[in-house]
């Protein structure tokens, strides 16, 4: 049993390492944003025993603009973008509590000269300009507006071979 893709969170990204049951993943606030105090960036693939369907828990994450970065200028296109903020530890505990976000929750603050990727604020959040469309078989499994109305898309890399190893179960590319 595996989970479908998790829900989208405004101003945040997530790189899913595993869709397996009980996998835990973390959303990362976009550069220039930070986790709002008291919200959680964590999600876990859990089983609804009544329906025997796996789903991701809903993160309470709210990514808010980082005031420290509001007045910084966009970087020139050639600037190397890197991050310099240590993420706060979070845990999925039975109580659902985690440390308050007193600082950015993730490595999402770019170096001073590269706080904002050029053009990233000029287009709708997460709006792709290229790539092929992937129709997800789980597109309507949760019914959240971000999942059912957003155009799904993908960018795939091609190369000489695929090394052996884990690949998210039940989720294959269409190339």
């Amino acid at each position: 049993i595996t989970c479908p893709p998790p829900m989208s969170v405004e101003h945040a990204d997530i790189w899913v390492k595993s869709y397996s049951l009980y996998s835990r993943e973390r959303y990362i606030c976009n550069s220039g944003f930070k986790r709002k105090a008291g919200t959680s960036s964590l999600t876990e693939c859990v089983l609804n025993k009544a329906t025997n369907v796996a789903h991701w828990t809903t993160p309470s994450l709210k990514c808010i603009r980082d005031p420290a970065l509001v007045h910084q200028r966009p970087a020139p296109p050639s600037t190397v973008t890197t991050a310099g903020v240590t993420p706060q530890p979070e845990s999925l505990s039975p109580s659902g509590k985690e440390p308050a976000a007193s600082s950015p929750s993730s490595n999402n603050t770019a170096a001073t000269t590269a706080a904002i990727v050029p053009g990233s604020q000029l287009m709708p959040s997460k709006s792709p300009s290229t790539g092929t469309t992937e129709i997800s078989s789980h597109e309507s499994s949760h019914g959240t507006p971000s999942q059912t109305t957003a155009k799904n898309w993908e960018l795939t890399a091609s190369a000489s071979h695929q090394p052996p190893g884990v690949y998210p179960q039940g989720h294959s590319d269409t190339t």
């Epitope: 893709p5 998790p6 829900m7 989208s8 969170v9 945040a12 990204d13 997530i14 790189w15 899913v16 390492k17 869709y19 990362i28 606030c29 976009n30 550069s31 220039g32 973008t81 890197t82 991050a83 993730s106 490595n107 999402n108 770019a110 590269a114 706080a115 904002i116 990727v117 990233s120 959040s125 997460k126 709006s127 792709p128 300009s129 290229t130 790539g131 992937e134 997800s136 971000s146 999942q147 957003a150 799904n152 898309w153 993908e154 960018l155 795939t156 890399a157 091609s158 190369a159 695929q162 690949y167 998210p168 989720h171 294959s172 590319d173 190339t175």
Partner: nanobody, 122 residues
Framework: EVQLVESGGGLVQPGGSLRLSCVGS????????VGWYRQTPGKQREWVAV???????DYAGSVKGRFTISRDNAKNTVYLQMNSLKPEDTAVYYC????????????????WGQGTQVTVSS
């Protein structure tokens, strides 16, 4: 479709540094989320780090504080700066231009480059 070429691997002593490069060709690489993975013989591929289009990053616990991922969109390149290397960092390192299944939701593509070997040994 994006093609990837990794480079920069080599033999380094424990405590040393290396910088790996992942050059992407094809449309869309600059707006891709790009991840680094590593694999040792007989073991499963292990996620190391990711950088998203906004520049935000995330790291595996085993490399946090030692590795830094960055990108230069003008050069269509993503870097992995590896400091304070340990023998257990020895592996073939691969980069991956992720698949986006929902806005802001990414996973590894099934297509991989040839990788670059990193060996940490005295």
């Amino acid at each position: 479709e994006v093609q990837l070429v990794e480079s920069g691997g080599g033999l380094v002593q424990p405590g040393g540094s290396l910088r790996l490069s992942c050059v992407g060709s094809g449309d869309g690489f600059s707006i891709s989320a790009v991840g680094w993975y590593r694999q040792t013989p007989g073991k499963q591929r292990e996620w190391v780090a990711v950088i998203f289009a906004s520049g935000s990053t995330d790291y595996a616990g085993s490399v946090k504080g030692r590795f830094t991922i960055s990108r230069d969109n003008a050069k269509n390149t993503v870097y992995l700066q590896m400091n304070s290397l340990k023998p257990e960092d020895t592996a073939v390192y691969y980069c991956n231009a992720g698949v986006t299944t929902n806005p802001g939701v990414h996973r590894a593509s099934r297509h991989w480059g040839q990788g670059t070997q990193v060996t940490v040994s005295s």
